[in-house]
Amino acid sequence: LDLSNVQSKCGSKDNIKHVPGGGSVQIVYK
């Protein structure tokens, strides 16, 4: 899955909360 063009708005995935789907996402993680 090539998501190299996705704009990341955070430094890492370390503090991603497990949400039930894309509808709960505030930003798109890289």
């Epitope: 899955l1 039930p20 894309g22 709960s24 930003i27 798109v28």
Partner: antibody
């Protein structure tokens, strides 16, 4: 390369339980959700639930709540799906899939499937 | 629960001709904050595990031929194959991941 390798076929009696494993390799196990999807013979795909290995947090399809338990062992990069109180309608191929959590929420890699047959 | 409805359920096609599959959701799959539709398309070829074709409604997965195009937003989505090839036969599923996950019933594409 990313691989999801599932355990072998199982034959179970009605009322018993089955535990299917899914060993991941080729990526950081904790960074992706693992989803479980089943497919009864000649039928479509049905999502059962998922786990985020980093936290152990799970979500389940309401249809299976109370009967399915999904777990993950970070030390071996293995996810497990246990289904209890088996009935004949649970005869299906069970797939694990890597879910690109936090981005596309799409299942980009799938295991080979595990056939579970429930028969007396 | 979000319900996904595909049509048609069976689609006989002629090689070289176009094909189109519709997928409708019972509620919008568009996240206004990320501006993404959480809708994916999968193909399950006979005897194989499903494979990802399209995510975010219209983004082609790496390695997927450009004859496959996903479109739509909100509740109405379409997968188009510009020129069907023999290797495209199988069952196509749409899937929402806006809230949990739900698959459509599947559309069986077969050569006439």
């Amino acid at each position: 390369q990313v691989q999801l390798v599932q355990s072998g076929a199982e034959v179970k009696k009605p009322g018993s339980s089955v535990k299917v494993s899914c060993k991941a390799s080729g990526y950081t196990f904790s960074d992706y959700v693992i989803s479980w999807v089943r497919q009864a013979p000649g039928q479509g795909l049905e999502w059962m639930g998922e786990i985020f290995p980093r936290s152990g947090s799970t979500y389940y399809n309401e249809k299976f709540k109370g009967r399915v338990t999904i777990t993950a062992d970070k030390s071996t990069s293995t996810a497990y799906m246990e289904l209890s109180s088996l009935r004949s309608e649970d005869t299906a191929v069970y797939y694990c899939a890597r879910d690109y959590y936090g981005t596309s929420f799409a299942m980009d890699y799938w295991g080979q499937g595990t056939l579970v047959t429930v028969s007396s | 629960d979000i319900v996904m409805t595909q049509s048609p359920l069976s689609l006989p096609v002629t090689p070289g001709e176009p094909a189109s599959i519709s997928c409708k959701s019972s509620q919008s799959l568009l996240n206004s904050r990320t501006r993404k539709n959480y809708l994916a398309w999968y193909l399950q070829k006979p005897g194989q595990s499903p494979q990802l074709l399209i995510y975010w409604a219209s983004t082609r997965e790496s390695g997927v031929p450009d004859r496959f195009t996903g479109s739509g937003s909100g509740t109405d989505f379409t997968l188009k194959i510009s020129r069907v090839e023999a290797e495209d036969v199988g069952v196509y599923y749409c899937k929402q991941s806006f809230y949990l996950r739900t698959f459509g019933q599947g559309t069986k594409v077969e050569i006439k």
